[in-house]
Amino acid sequence: MNGRVDYLVTEEEINLTRGPSGLGFNIVGGTDQQYVSNDSGIYVSRIKENGAAALDGRLQEGDKILSVNGQDLKNLLHQDAVDLFRNAGYAVSLRVQHRLQVQNGPIGHRGEGDPSG
C-alpha cells in the first residue's frame, strides 16, 4: 500500500530590508495567471542569490505570499501584485504561507526500527 502525502501549512511573518541586491525574488500568480488551479494567489517562483530573501533564509520557492506590509494580495492582477512589491519601500513585511510535504507511511505499517509496543 502506498503512503499518503499530506501537507503541513504554516504561516510566518518575515521582515526584510531591501539591500543593494533588493529583496531578490520573483513571483507568479494573480487573477489573470493562476499558478495553482483555482487559486489566484501570489507565489514565490525564484529566489536570487545575495538578495535580502536569500540572505535571510526563511522565504522559500513555492511559498504563498498572503500580504505585503499588511496589504492583502487576494484578487490582484499579476502586474498589480508586482507593482505593489516594487512600491513597498525599504522595509518590507511579508505574511507568508509555507506548505511542507509530509509523507505518511501505509496504515498499519510498522517500520523496522519501531518498538513493538
Partner: nanobody
Framework: EVQLVESGGGLVQAGGSLRLSCVAS????????MGWFRQAPGKEREFVAA????????DYPDSVKGRFTISRDNAKNTVYLQMNGLKPEDTAVYYC???????????????????WGQGTQVTVS
Amino acid sequence: EVQLVESGGGLVQAGGSLRLSCVASGGTFSSYDMGWFRQAPGKEREFVAAINWSGGSTDYPDSVKGRFTISRDNAKNTVYLQMNGLKPEDTAVYYCASRWRSGVDPYYYAGTYDYWGQGTQVTVS
C-alpha cells in the same frame, strides 16, 4: 547564459539624437525584463530606463523622462533606447542589463540584474 551586446553609441552634438540597441542571445528573451544603465567617469552607475518582459510597462528616472524612450522587439531579441535632446551630462558608457521577469524590486536596483553587456560609449559635446 544570456549574452548582451550593445551598439549605437558615438559622438553627438548637444540637442542631437542617438538610438542604442542591445541584442540578447542564449536565453528566452521574452522572459526577461530589460534595463539601461549608464556610468560616467568617476561617478556611480545610474539607472536610465527599463521595460518589462512584454513591453507593457516602462520606467525612467526624472533626469531622462520625456527625452529617452525604451522599447523592445521580442521577435528580434532586441531592446532599444531612443535618446533625444541629448545634453553634455548624458555623456557616459551605456550598459544594457537583463533580469528574470516579475522581480519584486524596482528597476533601478542594479544589483537585481543577472546579466550585463560590455557597454557602448555615448559622448555629447
